[in-house]
Interface confidence: medium
Amino acid sequence: KVFGRCELAAAMKRHGLDNYRGYSLGNWVCAAKFESNFNTQATNRNTDGSTDYGILQINSRWWCNDGRTPGSRNLCNIPCSALLSSDITASVNCAKKIVSDGNGMNAWVAWRNRCKGTDVQAWIRGCRL
């Protein structure tokens, strides 16, 4: 599923991401835009043999199990394929664990490079939330 911007903002708010660990909803929508272009089925392979999955591009080295990443920790205790569902529950729950891990949203390279320090509220402007 490819979400619309406001559609995703509403879904993320329903799942409790607004101001989760101090990060406003705009941060999460911005991260999803630059990680996956709002596509829940996005997958991207990394040079270390791991793969990033889903709307927030969660990595199989640490957070989920795709059955083929050497030394996978699977800290979210889920199959990576669950992160590709049109229902973003699994991605949100895992993202909450990631953002609580100490580095906050810096764990997402796209957020760090494209969203951090910008007017992230623009990503939810005009949305009925």
Partner: antibody, heavy 116, light 107 residues
Amino acid sequence: QVQLQESGAEVMKPGASVKISCKATGYTFSTYWIEWVKQRPGHGLEWIGEILPGSGSTYYNEKFKGKATFTADTSSNTAYMQLSSLTSEDSAVYYCARGDGWYGYWGQGTTLTVSS
Amino acid sequence: DIELTQSPATLSVTPGDSVSLSCRASQSISNNLHWYQQKSHESPRLLIKYVSQSSSGIPSRFSGSGSGTDFTLSINSVETEDFGMYFCQQSNSWPRTFGGGTKLEIK
């Protein structure tokens, strides 16, 4: 136990297309990548690409882009590979395998012969 | 693409001999190297994963070693059922690649 059952041998004419199937049993089909591998005598084993059945995500070896197309049906736990515009170079044994980084589970292979 | 070069191409041995098969990668692949055996008209069978981890049901006479770019599959006291082709495969990067194979034949 994990098993991959491939469709039977095919004899096709040059220019035609063929669709090979790979039915998986014994594990959660949607959560593991299915890999496709080509074997020709004297050419060893070649990785064609992979599909994650739960999402339909696919990756192809550049060499096989435009030649192979992967699909999967999670209701029947079956992965498919279609090969198009067949030539004699496509005559080979094609294997599906479960993608665990290594390939611990293989189909029995489908022999494709392209001949006029 | 990572190229895997296997040597020798053919190895002629007598049952009871011990042998070593080599697989060399064109660049470092850490420990992401796996070995397969294939007999005529059969699918490949996983022997060793991640350089040295034996696959389930594989006899203890098969062992693997190496790291980086140079890897070895050793067979301690070859048995008649061991004759066939042996392939290495890397999962360090895409596309996945295989070595050209070593044929183990009876002398």
